[in-house]
């Protein structure tokens, strides 16, 4: 007695797939595989398959039902912080070859990494034209101010909304200041936050306000304080610089905007007699902390002249270092003062039309605005590698 095995039905490839190998007929133990076109994937029911092979059985049936080749779907794209995503191919279309466009919130944010155009690729990931699978980044635009220029020296004026949107008020022990960098860092003076270096959460950080005592402000809290390793408390003010990492990003608007860090070319805007602007709630001529944010436009002072001014007692020799810059009038009267510590001395980069931080309010004579004495500021350009390392590492 002999019997012949039944041939199996000819396998019809699913849409967007093909059968391999192609044979005239398929008999016992013959097999075929299904391969999907690029951008399609094997599905059995709702379950994805890595591969599919069916074997012809003795009774003339295949051992597995035919799968489907279903179009790859990258799914809804991730939200972009401070930005948006647009569907370009069609509303909500997220399948193979669909295009989406990320963009950043106008005016206050700019896109980093790529152009924001992503395509749904065959691997199921949204991919940029550069091949990146990660989201682009919306970085805050820095150095925007309602003030168009520093202009001539004219001190002790009240600031108006949007004039110094990077200004940060730091409370915690004493009143100090800082300047917003990016959307989650504050640049300040080491001496202003030294006591809180191990208790960052004790710092009460306020921004987006002009009035020191106003209940209307944006609250931020500190996650960590980074004091320059070269700073020695109570032994001069060399390396008087610190960074505060905020525990949350702040929302950027016309009243809260970061200050720019100086470019390599920044020194050309910070030469002797160039005008910088210091702002803060520090002591005024009346001897009290200012209620309203004040600012003063002051010229850069020749470094040797400043060094000489602080060579005589009661100042120890070498008080003014190469990591400092000085600003003020020889005749006095225009200066930063106690309570302004940590605030930014800013300059207008006329090429980019953005304000940048050239100095950090650090120290000066016992009597603010004294003739023949100058305000001394930490020279920020000397610390760009340090700032960039801290920010990238943390």
């Amino acid at each position: 007695y002999t019997s012949t095995a039944q041939p199996c039905p000819y396998p019809m490839a699913p849409p967007n797939g093909h059968v391999s190998p192609v044979q005239a007929k398929y008999i016992l133990k013959d097999s075929f595989s299904i391969f999907c076109e690029t951008g399609y994937e094997l599905l059995q029911g709702h379950l994805p398959l890595k591969s599919f092979t069916a074997v012809c059985q003795k009774d003339g049936s295949w051992d597995r039902p035919m799968p489907a080749c279903s179009i790859v779907d990258c799914g809804p794209p991730d939200d972009l912080p401070s930005g948006r995503v647009e569907y370009i191919t069609g509303p909500g279309v997220t399948t193979y070859k669909a295009v989406i466009q990320y963009s950043c919130e106008e005016t206050f944010y700019t896109m980093k990494v790529n152009d924001g155009k992503y395509v749904c690729e065959a691997d199921g990931f949204w991919t940029s034209s550069k091949g990146e699978k990660s989201l682009p980044v919306c970085e805050p635009v820095c150095g925007l101010s309602a003030r168009t220029t520093g202009g001539r020296i004219y001190g002790g004026q009240k600031a108006k909304p949007g004039d110094f949107p990077w200004q940060v008020l730091i409370l915690g022990g004493t009143t100090a200041a800082g300047a917003l960098l990016y959307d989650n860092w504050v640049l300040t003076a080491a001496h202003a936050v030294y006591e809180q270096k191990h208790d960052a959460s004790a710092l009460d950080i306020r921004m987006g306000t002009l009035k020191r005592l106003s209940p209307h402000y944006t609250q931020a809290w500190s996650e960590a304080v980074f004091i320059h390793e070269g700073y020695t408390h109570d032994a001069g003010f060399d390396n008087d610089i610190a960074l505060i990492k905020l525990n949350n990003k702040v929302v950027i608007n016309s009243n809260i905007t970061p200050i720019c860090l100086p470019r390599k070319e920044a020194e050309s805007f910070m030469r002797t007699d160039d005008i910088g602007t210091a702002s803060g709630w520090g002591l005024t001529q009346r001897g009290f902390l200012a209620r309203n944010l004040m600012y003063v436009d002051i010229p850069i002072v020749d470094h040797q002249k400043c060094t000489a001014a602080y060579e005589k007692p009661p100042y120890p020799r070498g008080s003014v270092t190469a990591n400092m810059l000085c600003a003020g009038l020889e005749s006095g009267g225009k200066d930063s003062c106690r309570g302004d510590s940590g605030g930014a001395l800013v300059f207008l980069d006329s090429e980019t039309e953005r304000w940048f931080v050239g100095g950090i309010v650090s120290w000066g004579s016992m009597n603010c605005g004294e003739a023949g004495q100058y305000g001394v500021y930490t020279k920020v350009i000397n610390y760009i590698p340090w700032i960039e390392n801290i920010i990238s590492d943390f």
Epitope: D73, G75, S103
Partner: antibody, heavy 116, light 111 residues
């Protein structure tokens, strides 16, 4: 509370024009694609047009292409539908709806009647 | 354009019983991960309200007596047990491709 409020409906003569508005509140308008959907009296629903969150792309049903224009003003949280060369078959309740992947929030609608 | 055929056009169901509405698409509206079919409820004088998105995902705030199933071209909306307030017209809608289209609607009446 998320809300969409349409306005601008009314009686229009055939061949006439009308501009519908939809004011959004309670959400970040600039983050969402928006649609217009219409419903003729005692009839079913018909999708009319879509505009992406930043106005980069827009799509229309064939019957209104070249006659209707969807636009938006993100700072003012407002969606628009400019309708021209209106026909009697455009008579309907017009709804604006939020969503890129589905119509997740709807306004109460505004009625447009095209009649001489 | 993708045509969605809903059935039945109307149905009457006794309070507490199951209502089943079908929707058939003229072509597949499913990808490897999602089905682009949604269900809406519309009561007289009101705008539609999203019940179920992507075939089977209940929209937040919608009672659990509503459920959806299906993939490819065949989809079903189930309501069990039906309540008085479920009297409405139900629409299926696809967002697979432009133009987005709706089914003709199913009018549900509670007996």
């Amino acid at each position: 509370d998320v809300q969409l409020v349409e306005s601008g409906g009314g009686l229009v003569q055939p061949g006439g024009s009308r501009k519908l508005s939809c004011v959004a509140s309670g959400f970040t308008f600039s983050s969402f694609g928006m649609h217009w959907v219409r419903q003729a009296p005692e009839k079913g629903l018909e999708w009319v047009a879509y505009i992406s969150s930043g106005s980069s792309s827009s799509f229309y049903v064939d019957t209104v292409k070249g006659r209707f224009t969807i636009s938006r003003d993100n700072p003012k949280n407002t969606l628009f539908l400019q309708m021209t060369s209106l026909r009697s078959e455009d008579t309907a309740m017009y709804y604006c709806a939020r969503g890129d992947r589905n119509f997740e929030v709807w306004g109460a609608g505004t009625t447009v009647t095209v009649s001489s | 354009d993708i045509v969605l055929t809903q059935s039945p056009a109307s149905l009457a169901v006794s309070l507490g019983q199951r209502a089943t509405i079908s929707c058939r698409a003229s072509q597949s509206v499913s990808s490897s991960r999602y089905s682009y079919m949604h269900w809406f409820q519309q009561k007289p004088g009101q705008p539609p309200n999203l019940l179920i998105k992507h075939a089977s995902n209940l929209e937040s705030g919608v009672p659990a007596r509503f459920s959806g199933s299906g993939s490819g071209t065949d989809f079903t909306l189930n309501i069990h047990p039906v309540e008085e307030e479920d009297t409405a017209t139900y629409y299926c809608q696809q967002s697979w491709e432009v133009p987005w289209t709706f089914g003709g609607g199913t009018k549900l009446e509670i007996k």
